[in-house]
């Protein structure tokens, strides 16, 4: 899609990366909010979950998400046959048996009920960004990140390294 993209070029092999072990290295229960401090909330509607990005009223309780961390080997992009290093991947679960999924065809982020082992669409490369923020890159679609669009979560293509710090793909994790 983005032939000139450094991010795309480098991470085109993300889907070939191997999760080292099927057990998470650690888990973390946190609230998820945007760079602008809007909360990510989850609501059960018609037997399915909807994801919202909204301002909470004062003292309103934030929804929590269970982040499960996985260590993953990254294949070398130049030759395709070597290991270029390690990265951290996460899955995000706001409630039992439901996980955030990347729907690359619809460019959407959805909550799906599924059993383990989880599909690749539920895995995201966790990026440690400036200003105590993180970003989530799709394992199945390198160069595509979870972002905020029209008060919903969506998949956003990042076409250059400069855009990695675009505010709409930056999120904050908090224990409170």
């Amino acid at each position: 899609a983005f032939g000139i993209s450094g991010v795309q070029k480098y991470t085109r092999a993300l889907h070939d990366s191997s999760i080292t072990g099927i057990s998470p290295i650690t888990e973390y229960l946190a609230s998820l909010s945007t760079y602008n401090d809007q909360s990510i909330t989850f609501a059960l509607e018609d037997e399915s979950y909807e994801i919202y990005v909204e301002d909470l009223k004062k003292d309103e309780k934030k929804d929590k998400v269970l982040l499960s961390y996985y260590e993953s080997q990254h294949p070398s992009n130049e030759s395709g046959d070597g290991v270029d290093g390690k990265m951290l991947m996460v899955t995000l679960s706001p409630t039992k048996d439901f996980w955030l999924h990347a729907n690359n065809k619809e460019h959407s982020v959805e909550l799906h009920k599924c059993e383990k082992p989880l599909p690749d669409q539920a895995f995201f490369v966790l990026h440690n960004m400036h200003s105590n923020c993180v970003s989530f890159e799709c394992k199945t679609d390198p160069g595509v990140f979870i972002g905020v669009k029209d008060n919903h979560l969506a998949l956003i293509k990042v076409d250059s390294s400069e855009n990695l710090c675009t505010e709409n793909i930056l999120f904050k994790l908090s224990e409170t």
Epitope: G6, V7, K9, Y10, T11, I25, T26, E27, Y28, L29, A30, L67, Y69, H74, S76, N77, E78, D84, G85, K86, M87, L88, V125, L126, H127, N128, M129, H130, V134, S160, S161, E162, N163, L164, C165, L173
Partner: antibody, heavy 119, light 111 residues
Framework: EVQLVESGGGLVQPGGSLRLSCAAS????????MSWVRQAPGKGLEWVAT????????DYVDSVKGRFTISRDDSKNTLYLQMNSLRAEDTAVYYC????????????WGQGTLVTVSS | EIVLTQSPATLSLSPGERATLSCRAS??????????LNWFQQKPGQPPRLLIF???NRGSGVPARFSGSGSGTDFTLTISSLEPEDFAVYYC?????????FGQGTKVEIK
């Protein structure tokens, strides 16, 4: 193969300037955060400066703020460290380092280049 | 800044013995539920090499005899059975916040 090769070190007088370079190969340079870490002779390691992928953010250790500038040229796959107002205590081997993909730790290191500040 | 204190300064052991190195942080290095404490090995005339990241995860190509443990402020690097090539200086380092800091190092020498 992922490689980092530093150059530009040498002998310089106190108050002088030097520019270090780090040529990167074997990976898509622009996607990674890069740093300089130094080691004085017979001493431990000290982080000096970091620049994010995309050149958006830079950070420095207090002792070099206002004197050193980290920069990168993604078109040349090269990291730089411009060092001005050099002091004797800046004498060290300077290592270029690449973060892992996702920017959580220093994963790849160059062989280093020696900077000696002396009159 | 976060100060990392390593002990002992020097460890004198024989090949085949178990080495236990300690690193203590002046405050927690936890962030996002991860312990952002890394271990490096350095041999004379060589650059450091990543051994362990996020307290307990081995870097690429690192032998299984190296293991890391700990959380919060107290961390340990263990070499289960020392090989001749393991005699070197070991540094812990925190990547929780700027300035990124290193411990002063532990030298593992042949007894």
């Amino acid at each position: 193969e992922v490689q980092l090769v530093e150059s530009g070190g040498g002998l310089v007088q106190p108050g002088g300037s030097l520019r270090l370079s780090c040529a990167a190969s074997g990976f898509t340079f622009s996607s990674f955060s890069m740093s300089w870490v130094r080691q004085a002779p017979g001493k431990g390691l000290e982080w000096v400066a970091t620049i994010s992928g995309g050149k958006t953010f830079t950070d420095y250790v207090d002792s070099v703020k206002g004197r050193f500038t980290i920069s990168r040229d993604d078109s040349k796959n090269t990291l730089y460290l411009q060092m001005n107002s050099l002091r004797a205590e800046d004498t060290a081997v300077y290592y270029c380092t690449r973060a892992n993909y996702g920017n959580w730790f220093f994963e790849v290191w160059g062989q280093g280049t020696l900077v000696t500040v002396s009159s | 800044e976060i100060v990392l204190t390593q002990s002992p300064a020097t460890l004198s052991l024989s090949p085949g013995e178990r080495a236990t190195l300690s690193c203590r942080a002046s405050e927690s290095v936890a962030k996002y539920g991860l312990s952002l404490l890394n271990w490096f090995q350095q041999k004379p005339g060589q650059p450091p090499r990543l051994l362990i990241f996020a307290a307990s995860n081995r870097g690429s190509g690192v032998p299984a005899r190296f293991s890391g443990s700990g959380s919060g402020t107290d961390f340990t690097l263990t070499i289960s059975s020392l090989e001749p090539e393991d005699f070197a200086v070991y540094y812990c380092q925190q990547s929780k916040e700027v300035p990124f800091t290193f411990g002063q190092g532990t030298k593992v020498e042949i007894k």
